[in-house]
């Protein structure tokens, strides 16, 4: 639009002046005036600001508390926050990853559809007909029943979703 109907994108209005915002990684020390420019200062160690801003204080980097099962995935900079993830075998309880819980195991009769990551839990699925799982595991998929035929054996005991079939020798034909 012409003429302008607001301050420019990286500016803010204060005391009739359109002042420059501080760039990411810096905080506001003093507003611009008719005589002076906006004064900004870099954020300190372990602090950040991730947007153009007029904040007088930088934000503290997130602390990845090992007591909560957390570890640093990506170290923060003056422009970005620290990113936490969970220790091996654990996953975040929320998107913000403020604490961790142990990966769930899939009970017998269920197999792992998707192995857990640092941010998502194990996904289990019931073993369909022809498959079984006889252990509680965070890694094991449903296994197919043993094929007795390929071993020249016969099914002696039918399989379930928790047990494999039991194979045995074929009955001898009587004379």
């Amino acid at each position: 639009p012409e003429p302008p109907t607001a301050c420019r994108e990286k500016q803010y209005l204060i005391n009739s002046q359109c002042c420059s915002l501080c760039q990411p990684g810096q905080k506001l020390v003093s507003d611009c005036t008719e005589f002076t420019e906006t004064e900004c200062l870099p954020c300190g160690e372990s602090e950040f600001l991730d947007t153009w801003n007029r904040e007088t204080h930088c934000h503290q980097h997130k602390y990845c508390d090992p007591n909560l099962g957390l570890r640093v995935q990506q170290k923060g900079t003056s422009e970005t926050d620290t990113i936490c993830t969970c220790e091996e075998g654990w996953h975040c309880t929320s998107e913000a990853c403020e604490s961790c819980v142990l990966h769930r195991s899939c009970s017998p009769g269920f197999g792992v559809k998707q192995i857990a990551t640092g941010v998502s839990d194990t996904i289990c699925e019931p073993c369909p007909v022809g498959f079984f799982s006889n252990v509680s595991s965070a890694f094991e998929k449903c296994h197919p029943w043993t094929s007795c035929e390929t071993k020249d054996l016969v099914v002696q005991q039918a399989g379930t979703n928790k047990t494999d079939v039991v194979c045995g020798p074929q009955d001898r034909l009587r004379a």
């Epitope: 003429p3 302008p4 420019r8 994108e9 990286k10 209005l13 009739s16 359109c18 420059s20 420019e37």
Partner: antibody, heavy 125, light 107 residues
Framework: QVQLVQSGAEVKKPGASVKVSCKAS????????MYWVRQAPGQGLEWMGW????????TYAQKFQGRVTMTRDTSISTAYMELSRLRSDDTAVYYC??????????????????WGQGTLVTVSS | DIQLTQSPSFLSASVGDRVTITCRAS??????LAWYQQKPGKAPKLLIY???TLQSGVPSRFSGSGSGTEFTLTISSLQPEDFATYYC?????????FGQGTKVEIK
């Protein structure tokens, strides 16, 4: 303090291109629009257009459309104005100027509060 | 494009004189007008913006007035350092045009 320092004088042949630089210091470069104005010898001032240093988006005066390119490098707080297919009547001093905006009576009033020292571009065969 | 016509184009005056320069716009521009001073071989310097607001650091002998199509720049008591060329600029409609200039010379 705010300073806009431009590149040195250039002599070019008709049909050639020239690229003038304008290095800003003393303020947040991406926070203020940068304008280009030229002045032919003994003549008045002519507005050429502007660039938003944050996004890099330029706006050109109709007269220069197709011949002028305004760019910037935020890493070195420098704006550039390139004029192509030069003619003898492009001989002029080229200025960069920073926009300031004042708010009063419900309106936003722009003006050019800081200017570069000027770059003389001479086009001669 | 909006045309700005300054009058006079040349002006001879003495130190201490009150000087008035007029700038007329070809159409209404509200208060979107600035005044600049330019000395030979130098870049223009902002004096007045929003038609009547004095730029910081500019002596109070300079003043601006007007709105719509007619504007004036007044120097209440001309000083030796004021001998220069003065330009008005409209910032209402692109392209942001300038007046042709008024040269203030020593009488």
């Amino acid at each position: 303090q705010v300073q806009l320092v431009q590149s040195g004088a250039e002599v070019k042949k008709p049909g050639a291109s020239v690229k003038v630089s304008c290095k800003a210091s003393g303020y947040t470069f991406a926070g203020y629009y940068m304008y280009w104005v030229r002045q032919a010898p003994g003549q008045g001032l002519e507005w050429m257009g502007w660039i938003n240093p944050d996004s890099g988006a330029p706006t050109y005066a109709q007269k220069f459309q197709g011949r002028v390119t305004m760019t910037r490098d935020t890493s070195i707080s420098t704006a550039y104005m390139e004029l192509s297919r030069l003619r003898s009547d492009d001989t002029a001093v080229y200025y960069c100027a920073r926009e300031k905006i004042y708010y009063g009576s419900g309106n936003y009033y722009p003006s050019f509060d800081y200017w570069g020292q000027g770059t003389l571009v001479t086009v001669s065969s | 494009d909006i045309q700005l016509t300054q009058s006079p184009s040349f002006l001879s005056a003495s130190v201490g004189d009150r000087v008035t320069i007029t700038c007329r716009a070809s159409q209404g521009i509200s208060s979107y007008l600035a005044w600049y001073q330019q000395k030979p071989g130098k870049a223009p310097k902002l004096l007045i913006y929003a038609a009547s607001t004095l730029q910081s650091g500019v002596p109070s002998r300079f003043s601006g007035s007007g709105s719509g199509t007619e504007f004036t720049l007044t120097i209440s008591s001309l000083q030796p350092e004021d001998f220069a060329t003065y330009y008005c600029q409209q910032l209402f409609s692109y392209p942001w045009t300038f007046g042709q200039g008024t040269k203030v010379e020593i009488k």
